[in-house]
């Protein structure tokens, strides 16, 4: 028989949700208003196209992504629109308050609803950590905690490190990864006994989840050109990146292959190992001088992404009870990590050829930020698993974990799905 | 050649409102960003605002924020200053700047590296 | 001006000249100096940018440096012609904007 929402979840859902909109909407109508200066509509709707790129890659690529379980694909694809929609809101805020609002209103412009997007994104990249062992009232706190934490992340880093929108954004990257890492680890682990199949993927979810991959891997240049300043900056990002996810395709198909005692690809590993370039240049991606820098980036990306979703599932899924699948989190802390360090270098060339030691300087403060993304993500993700963990959410039972039928109607199944 | 004309200045009181244009030639107006800088008699710069390439991103000054507002139309290769509530203090050669760069391994630096020759504002009742 | 710098300064042609520029850790301390002349009657030129390059035109008298929050511009083989207003710049984190010097009036004697 069909499994329904507990009685108290179905009260307790609409009202938190609709009560959280109705506050975002009077605090829209009392602190924002549009930025009325927009003199050339050409340039408006080519700042919009980026802001769409991001959209369609959080919506569709995001979202169809995590979608590959055999039984909570639905789930998977709507929760992350839900999540979207409402961190977008609470991101332009919580933007506006801590950057703008001293001088007054928050001013909405096309830049502000990018930058939302992107902070929004930060929440998809975790929940893959826990989608499947949460209800959507969980979801809730979690993007609220989520974009809060990586909003002040960034003021503090924009403030203290002197970092641009670009560098500070580029943290999302990890902060995403070990703060959704985290949340995971505070969760009910165990599957209980019968219901092992349900976080397995199936072909048709497989699929959906390639469809996602393939948006993500044909948008991620415009996600790491998006808060660049300059024309060149954003022409070098858009090259750097789509050449290192090139080469990142053909080292996951390959590399898969070559991992795999008769030689077979996993679905799984090339899911996420396509993205690994994206993420491992995004950092310095406006930065890197030569194509071929860019594709070595994007070929040492892809083996870590395949040797990581080889080895490194049978580990979380025991510590963190995330399961095989769920493989971005751990995928995107690496990555993050690498091209966190790729900036390093680059910093440290800046010393040897300029023989200065201000840039000396910038390289602890480079090493500082990264410390200080890390620390912020597990604190926040251990407050938020801890907030996920009380029982005014009504968590679905662990029985219950990975199954559309808990959250969705489904008409035409009387029994099993 | 790169020129940049700016236009609109006078006299005008205190408390109303003012709009200053600088046309661009000579190189790819939406390939830069643009600065206002200004100068009051017998004093020094000071930095007014700041406007991204494409109209994305805006930055101004704490003693202006509020009052005035940059813009920019590409297509008419025109930068503009709307100045809100002016004040005496606003007394000033307004002068135009093209935004440039320079890479190092591991950033951009910006400077201005074109000027215009500035439009005189002066606010007095 | 967020950056201190002396009102003016004087030198005989063909002396060596400099003009200093004070500032703090959120402006010269962690961001690049610039330097702009000034002729009179004029719109200002960049002379020096990230703390000591020069652009193409700009004679190799002209030099920078830079030492914590302090920087100095060096003019060296003083001319008729260098006689005009000198500004330091520099971004300010803080303020999140830019910020000059007072200005430096350098009189060729």
């Known amino acids: 028989m069909s499994s329904k929402y507990p009685r108290s979840v179905r009260r307790c859902l609409p009202l938190w949700a609709l009560t959280l909109e109705a506050a975002l909407i009077l605090l829209f109508y009392f602190f924002t208003h549009y930025d009325a200066s927009l003199e050339d509509q050409k340039g408006l709707v080519a700042s919009y196209q980026v802001g769409q790129d991001l959209t369609v890659m959080a919506a569709i690529g995001l979202g169809f992504l995590t979608s590959s379980f055999r039984r909570h694909s639905w789930s998977s694809v709507a929760f992350n629109l839900f999540m979207l929609a409402l961190g977008v809101q609470w991101a332009i805020l919580l933007d506006g308050f801590l950057s703008q609002f001293p001088s007054g209103k928050v001013v909405i412009t096309l830049f502000s609803i990018r930058l939302a997007t992107m902070s929004a994104l930060s929440v998809l990249i975790s929940v893959d950590a826990v989608l499947g062992k949460v209800n959507l009232a969980q979801l809730v706190v979690m993007v609220l905690v989520e974009v809060t934490a990586l909003g002040n992340l960034r003021m503090v880093i924009s403030n203290i490190f002197n970092t641009d929108y670009h560098m500070n954004m580029m943290h999302i990257y990890v902060f995403a990864a070990y703060f959704g890492l985290s949340v995971a680890w505070c969760l009910p682990k165990p599957l209980p006994e019968g219901t092992e199949d349900k976080d397995q993927t199936a072909t048709i979810p497989s699929l959906s989840a390639m469809l996602g991959a393939l948006f993500l891997w044909m948008f991620w240049p415009s996600f790491n050109s998006a808060l660049l300043r300059s024309p060149i900056e954003r022409k070098n990002a858009v090259f750097n990146t789509y050449y290192a996810v090139a080469v990142s395709v053909v080292t996951a198909i390959s590399g898969s292959s070559l991992a795999h005692p008769q030689g077979k690809i996993s679905k799984t590993y090339v899911h996420s190992a396509v993205l690994a370039g994206g993420v491992a240049v995004g950092t310095s991606c406006h930065l890197i001088p030569s194509p071929w820098l860019a594709m070595v980036l994007g070929l040492v990306a892809g083996l870590i992404s395949v040797g990581g979703a080889k080895y490194l599932p049978g580990c979380c899924n025991r510590v963190l009870g995330i399961p095989h699948s769920s493989i971005m989190g751990y995928n995107f802390s690496l990555l993050g990590l690498l091209g966190e360090i790729i900036y390093i270098v680059l910093l440290v060339l800046d010393t040897v050829g300029a023989g200065n030691g201000m840039i000396g300087f910038q390289v602890l403060l480079s090493i500082g930020e990264l410390s200080l993304a890390i620390v912020i993500a597990l604190m926040s993700g251990l407050l938020t698993g801890l907030l996920l963990n009380l029982k005014i959410w009504k968590a679905p039972h662990e029985a219950k974990y990975f199954d559309d039928q808990v959250f969705w109607k489904f008409p035409h199944l009387a029994v099993g799905f | 050649e790169v020129q940049l004309l700016e236009s609109g200045g006078g006299v005008v009181q205190p408390g109303r409102s003012l709009r200053l244009s600088c046309v661009v030639s000579g190189f790819t107006f939406n390939n830069y960003g643009m600065h206002w800088v200004r100068q009051a008699p017998g004093k020094g710069l000071e930095w007014v605002a700041v406007?991204?390439?494409?109209?994305?991103?805006?930055y101004y000054a704490d003693s202006v924020k509020g009052r005035f507002t940059i813009s920019r139309d590409n297509s008419k290769n025109t930068l503009y200053l709307q100045m809100n509530s002016l004040r005496a203090e606003d007394t000033a050669v307004y002068y135009c700047?093209?935004?440039?760069?320079?890479?190092?391994?591991?950033?951009?630096?910006?400077?201005?590296?074109?000027w215009g020759q500035g439009t005189l504002v002066t606010v007095s009742s | 001006a967020e950056l201190t710098q002396p009102p003016s300064a004087s030198g005989t042609p063909g002396q060596r000249v400099t003009i200093s520029c004070s500032g703090s850790?959120?402006?010269?301390?962690?961001?690049?100096v610039y330097w702009y002349q000034q002729l009179p009657g004029t719109a200002p030129k960049l002379l020096i940018y990230s703390n000591n390059q020069r652009p193409s035109g700009v004679p190799d008298r002209f030099s920078a440096f830079k030492s914590g929050t302090s920087a100095s511009l060096a003019i060296t083989g003083l001319q008729a012609e260098d006689e005009a207003n000198y500004y330091c710049q520099s971004y300010d984190s803080g303020l999140s904007g830019w910020v000059f010097g007072g200005g430096t009036k350098l009189t060729v004697l």
């Open positions: 406007i991204w390439f494409d109209g994305s991103n805006k």
């Open positions: 850790s959120s402006n010269i301390g962690s961001k690049y």
């Open positions: 700047a093209r935004e440039n760069q320079i890479k190092l391994w591991s950033r951009y630096l910006y400077y201005f590296d074109y």
